[in-house]
Amino acid sequence: EPPTACREKQYLINSQCCSLCQPGQKLVSDCTEFTETECLPCGESEFLDTWNRETHCHQHKYCDPNLGLRVQQKGTSETDTICTCEEGWHCTSEACESCVLHRSCSPGFGVKQIATGVSDTICEPCPVGFFSNVSSAFEKCHPWTSCETKDLVVQQAGTNKTDVVCGPQDRLR
């Protein structure tokens, strides 16, 4: 009876279990009743990082110097290239696909510490009573407007991203 599931590092095809290709190799042909799975090593600038049945290897990531990137760790047949930024620059994400001089703090966050040559911008969430409605690399959280000092009342509550909205007090007739 043909199998319906295969062991780890195998895959089911044409009602039989074939061995997956090991990391660093791609699939050339599936196994048959009489032959093993045929695999081939990835090329010079290619990789596959898992046991697989891929017919094409992935291209190594290119660390584009025009984006401020350089190679932190050269890729192998089993691993992708790891990029980092030129000295004094910071990756925009964990994948490090581009570089910025310093990060900015999103709305709802204020700048706790402005970037220096060695450290990136440090952001902090705006606490209750404060807001930031902009992305900035220098602006702190701003306090909500005090309606009372303007002889007004709060018409709309503030949030970490918006100021309070003040309005006139209801006058008793």
Epitope: N66, E86, S98, C99, V100, L101, A137, F138
Partner: nanobody, 116 residues
Framework: EVQLLESGGGLVQPGGSLRLSCAAS???????EMWWVRQAPGKGLERVS?????????YYADSVKGRFTISRDNSKNTLYLQMNSLRAEDTAVYYC?????????WGQGTLVTVSS
């Protein structure tokens, strides 16, 4: 394509003044926080000054506070840095940058030399 073209640098004696300009194109200037940064020969980048999109809030590094003034004219898509009481340690290439300060937005800069 974002373009930031700095100008106004030159040789000036200590105690003198210069006004740097940065002509911006390729993006909606009035929507962006802008910065001046500088790089002295053989040194790292130093954040000098910043201004919010409306021009109502500013930041100055301690080293230039009271001597430099940042401003912007959103109708002319231009950023300025008025530099007074210049010192030898202000000698550097000055760059203007827009948030979020990506590497490819880097201009050519303008060289300021303070020397007697």
């Amino acid at each position: 394509e974002v373009q930031l073209l700095e100008s106004g640098g030159g040789l000036v004696q200590p105690g003198g003044s210069l006004r740097l300009s940065c002509a911006a194109s390729g993006f909606t200037f009035r929507d962006y926080e802008m910065w001046w940064v500088r790089q002295a020969p053989g040194k790292g980048l130093e954040r000098v000054s910043a201004i919010n999109p409306q021009g109502t809030r500013t930041y100055y590094a301690d080293s230039v506070k009271g001597r430099f003034t940042i401003s912007r004219d959103n109708s002319k898509n231009t950023l300025y840095l008025q530099m007074n009481s210049l010192r030898a340690e202000d000698t550097a290439v000055y760059y203007c940058l827009k948030l979020p300060f990506t590497f490819e937005d880097w201009g050519q800069g303008t060289l300021v030399t303070v020397s007697s």
